[in-house]
Interface confidence: low
C-alpha cells in the first residue's frame, strides 16, 4: 500500500527531468503542436504531417500551378491565379511555387482594381485636351487642357498638346489665331503682300498725276473772251478737298480691301462660335 | 451555372420610359463587363449598351445615346438599363448578357424580356 505512493512520486520526478515545462511560445519559423515545437514549412512547401517526439515536420513541394509564400503550416498549396483573357488579362509574371500569377490587362487597357481581378479601356483624351500620362497596365490615362500656345484636335489616349505653329520661323504672319483645339493658320508676310500693293499704289498716283496735268492744260486753254490787257495768266491754286488731291483715303481702303487679315478675324470669331456650341 | 433573368419589359406608348432588370448567378458578377442587346422582330441581334465591372465607365450605341442608361448594382448581382423616350423602333426582345473583353461580345445571355413601344 505504502508503495504506490512512493512510485508515484518517483515516475513523477523522472517524467520532469526527461520532459521539462511545455513551452507556450516557439522560436521564429516554428509552430507549437501538441506542447511542443514544431519547424514551419518553407515557402513553396506544404504540411504532411507535424513533427513528434523523435520525427522532424513532414513537407512537400507545391504541386505545378500551386504556391506558398510564407514560412507556413498549410495542409494545401493555394491554386496560382488564372489570368483570365475573356476578362482583358494576361499573365505580365508566371507563377512559381512561392510567388502567385501576376496578371495585367491587355494593350490598351487597365486593371480595375489593385487585384486586378477584370480591365477596362483607356480613356481618351477628348479635342482640346491632351494625355498629361499615359496609362498603364493599372491606371487610367490622366488628361490636361491644352494650354495656351497649344492644341489638340484629336481624341487620343497617347497625343500630348502640340505647340501652335510658329509662323515666325517660316517667314510668314498669323493669319488666324489658333484655339486649344486648332493650330493657328500662317499666311504670306506684309512684305510679300507689298509686292502686289505698292505698284498699285504707284498706279493710282500716276492716274492722279495724269489728271492734275490734264487739268492744268484745260486751264491754260484761251478763253474765246478778250482778257484785261494787265491780267497776267494766274496760277491756280487747288483746295485741299479736290478729288484727288488726298490721295490717302482711297490707297488706305484699297490696301483694307486686299488684306485679307481683316477678313480672316471676322472668319476666326465664326468658328469660335461653332466650337462652343 | 450562369444563369441571367430579364425583367421589366412590357407595353409602353412612345416617349415613355421602362426600367429592365438582370439578375445575375452562377459567377462572380462584380468582374465581369456587361451588356444589353436586342432584337427587333424579323431582325438580327443588335448591341444596345455596355458597362464595366465597376460601373465606371458604358458605352451605347449611336441609336440609344442619349435617351438609355445602363448601370448596376454589384452587391445585388443586378444588371438595369433605364430607357427614356422610347420609340416604335425601340420595339425588340431585350437580353441582357455576360461580356467578353476586351472585344465585349458576350458568351452568355438570358431568355429576353418584350418591350413593346406602340400607341
Known amino acids: 500500500m505504502v508503495r504506490l505512493p512512493l512510485q508515484c512520486v518517483l515516475w513523477g520526478c523522472l517524467l520532469t527531468a526527461v520532459h521539462p515545462e511545455p513551452p507556450t511560445a516557439c522560436r521564429e519559423k516554428q509552430y507549437l503542436i501538441n506542447s511542443q515545437c514544431c519547424s514551419l514549412c518553407q515557402p513553396g512547401q506544404k504540411l504532411v504531417s507535424d513533427c513528434t517526439e523523435f520525427t522532424e515536420t513532414e513537407c512537400l513541394p507545391c504541386g505545378e500551378s500551386e504556391f506558398l509564400d510564407t514560412w507556413n503550416r498549410e495542409t494545401h498549396c493555394h491554386q496560382h491565379k488564372y489570368c483570365d483573357p475573356n476578362l482583358g488579362l494576361r499573365v505580365q509574371q508566371k507563377g512559381t511555387s512561392e510567388t502567385d500569377t501576376i496578371c495585367t490587362c491587355e494593350e490598351g487597357w487597365h486593371c480595375t482594381s489593385e487585384a486586378c481581378e477584370s480591365c477596362v479601356l483607356h480613356r481618351s483624351c477628348s479635342p482640346g485636351f491632351g494625355v498629361k500620362q499615359i496609362a498603364t497596365g493599372v491606371s487610367d490615362t490622366i488628361c490636361e487642357p491644352c494650354p495656351v500656345g497649344f492644341f489638340s484636335n484629336v481624341s487620343s489616349a497617347f497625343e500630348k498638346c502640340h505647340p501652335w505653329t510658329s509662323c515666325e520661323t517660316k517667314d510668314l504672319v498669323v493669319q488666324q489665331a489658333g484655339t486649344n483645339k486648332t493650330d493657328v493658320v500662317c499666311g504670306p508676310q506684309d512684305r510679300l503682300r507689298a509686292l502686289v500693293v505698292i505698284p498699285i499704289i504707284f498706279g493710282i498716283l500716276f492716274a492722279i498725276l495724269l489728271v492734275l496735268v490734264f487739268i492744268k492744260k484745260v486751264a491754260k486753254k484761251p478763253t474765246n473772251k478778250a482778257p484785261h490787257p494787265k491780267q497776267e495768266p494766274q496760277e491756280i491754286n487747288f483746295p485741299d478737298d479736290l478729288p484727288g488731291s488726298n490721295t490717302a483715303a482711297p490707297v488706305q481702303e484699297t490696301l483694307h480691301g486686299c488684306q485679307p487679315v481683316t477678313q480672316e478675324d471676322g472668319k476666326e470669331s465664326r468658328i469660335s462660335v461653332q466650337e462652343r456650341q | 451555372e450562369v444563369q441571367l433573368l430579364e425583367s421589366g419589359g412590357g407595353l409602353v406608348q412612345p416617349g415613355g420610359s421602362l426600367r429592365l432588370s438582370c439578375a445575375a448567378s452562377?459567377?462572380?458578377?462584380?468582374?465581369?463587363?456587361m451588356t444589353w442587346v436586342r432584337q427587333a422582330p424579323g431582325k438580327g441581334l443588335e448591341w444596345v449598351s455596355s458597362i464595366d465591372p465597376q460601373g465606371g465607365m458604358t458605352y451605347y450605341a449611336d441609336s440609344v445615346k442619349g435617351r438609355f442608361t445602363i448601370s448596376r448594382d454589384n452587391s445585388k448581382n443586378t444588371l438595369y438599363l433605364q430607357m427614356n423616350s422610347l420609340r416604335a423602333e425601340d420595339t425588340a426582345v431585350y437580353y441582357c448578357?455576360?461580356?467578353?473583353?476586351?472585344?465585349?461580345?458576350?458568351?452568355?445571355w438570358g431568355q429576353g424580356t418584350l418591350v413593346t413601344v406602340s400607341s
Open positions: 452562377g459567377f462572380t458578377f462584380r468582374v465581369y463587363w
Open positions: 448578357a455576360k461580356a467578353r473583353i476586351p472585344n465585349l461580345e458576350f458568351d452568355y
